[in-house]
């Protein structure tokens, strides 16, 4: 048993039939010594008396809010949560496996630049009685500070018969050095509580590996005289790290016909302009990637040819 937060305890249980469970001793937070009784949740059944209560925790029916009373007055509450371990593996019932980039990916994180700011998100089908708490650090043995905000519901989607809820959190490394080579990874830890079930999820990454630039901005076309060619120009996204001479991007320019089956013409360039042939009803799209490190491409910025 360990304390998640003041008065909230997590009991770690091996989850199999007829498991012995864990013995837990609760102490009433009061200077009183006599006449103390204990109840669980909304029940008025007295479980025991005295300043301490010893219980055997085996299942969810044994978890919940334990309250000590004296003479009809509530003295204090303790909440017991359960963390299940089945076949040596901690349960992952609360979050959905996103399966990208690999199986057992519950947390996904992205950064728009090298400032030390990043966003993580996760999915669940649970809509109520759900709490998330996020902590992060750079390294784990001698951790350096990363500050995370509150996890918020960022999207709701219908997937077949189920509703899916996306939560996200923004974090910022306290003393980020954008130009420095990373040697220790960022660690992100998410505590999830659904009703009386506790689970924790972790992710470890280097900022350089989760970089995904915003799409190029101000995408414009300039027709070239007496030609089917156009000059496409764009700018670095505002959110990209500066100076651009050091934090450079490379770009992919694509001409796509109306039909997805039509052949795509692609041009790769380090410049912020390119000359392409603009076919009727086609569109021109540009995306960006870190020039010196193959992290994710940005989403496409697009304009119609006409």
């Amino acid at each position: 048993i360990w304390e998640l937060k003041k008065d909230v305890y997590v009991v770690e249980l091996d989850w199999y039939p007829d498991a012995p469970g864990e013995m837990v001793v609760l102490t009433c937070d009061t200077p009183e010594e006599d006449g103390i009784t204990w109840t669980l949740d909304q029940s008025s059944e007295v479980l025991g008396s005295g300043k301490t209560l010893t219980i055997q925790v085996k299942e969810f029916g044994d978890a919940g809010q334990y309250t000590c009373h004296k003479g009809g007055e509530v003295l204090s509450h303790s909440l017991l949560l359960l963390h299940k371990k089945e076949d040596g593996i901690w349960s992952t019932d609360i979050l959905k496996d996103q399966k990208e980039p690999k199986n057992k990916t519950f947390l996904r994180c992205e950064a728009k630049n090298y400032s030390g700011r990043f966003t993580c998100w996760w999915l669940t089908t649970i809509s109520t009685d759900l709490t998330f708490s996020v902590k992060s650090s750079r390294g784990s043995s001698d951790p350096q500070g990363v500050t995370c905000g509150a996890a918020t519901l960022s999207a709701e989607r219908v997937r077949g018969d189920n509703k899916e809820y996306e939560y996200s959190v923004e974090c910022q490394e306290d003393s980020a050095c954008p130009a420095a080579e990373e040697s220790l990874p960022i660690e992100v830890m998410v505590d999830a509580v659904h009703k009386l079930k506790y689970e924790n999820y972790t992710s470890s990454f280097f900022i350089r590996d989760i970089i995904k630039p915003d799409p190029p901005k101000n995408l414009q076309l300039k027709p070239l005289k007496n030609s089917r060619q156009v000059e496409v120009s764009w700018e670095y996204p505002d959110t990209w790290s500066t100076p651009h001479s050091y934090f450079s991007l490379t770009f992919c320019v694509q001409v796509q016909g109306k039909s997805k089956r039509e052949k795509k013409d692609r041009v790769f360039t380090d410049k912020t302009s390119a000359t392409v042939i603009c076919r009727k009803n086609a569109s021109i799209s540009v995306r960006a990637q870190d020039r010196y490190y193959s992290s994710s491409w940005s989403e496409w910025a697009s304009v119609p040819c006409s």
Partner: nanobody, 123 residues
Framework: EVQLVESGGGLVQAGGSRRVSCAAS????????MAWFRQAPGKEREFVAA????????DYADSVKGRFTISRDNAKNTVYLQMNSLKPEDTAAYYC????????????????WGQGTQVTVSS
Amino acid sequence: EVQLVESGGGLVQAGGSRRVSCAASGLTFSDYSMAWFRQAPGKEREFVAAHAWLASRTDYADSVKGRFTISRDNAKNTVYLQMNSLKPEDTAAYYCAAGQRYLSRVSQGYEYWGQGTQVTVSS
């Protein structure tokens, strides 16, 4: 600097309703349990209701159970106290408090306090 600012107090007739709010700043709101206490003239400050940092976990004093509802909006960093079927004995200054404990009924369980908002129930 942590600030808790209560609002919504005022004069209300017995049997009526009122909602008081408490806006928090300077703390990670979702990590804190929030509570309402009240103090009537010449009386000690007493616990009214608490909402833990954990979803759906609330606690009420017997005197307000079934009449008052505490709720919180983590996106707005705000906690509310909806008071229905008000009685003259509910007249008091209502104080908002924030603390790291789960659900405490004692004032020592809360580190931060607001300045209070006055609710007067006339008969």
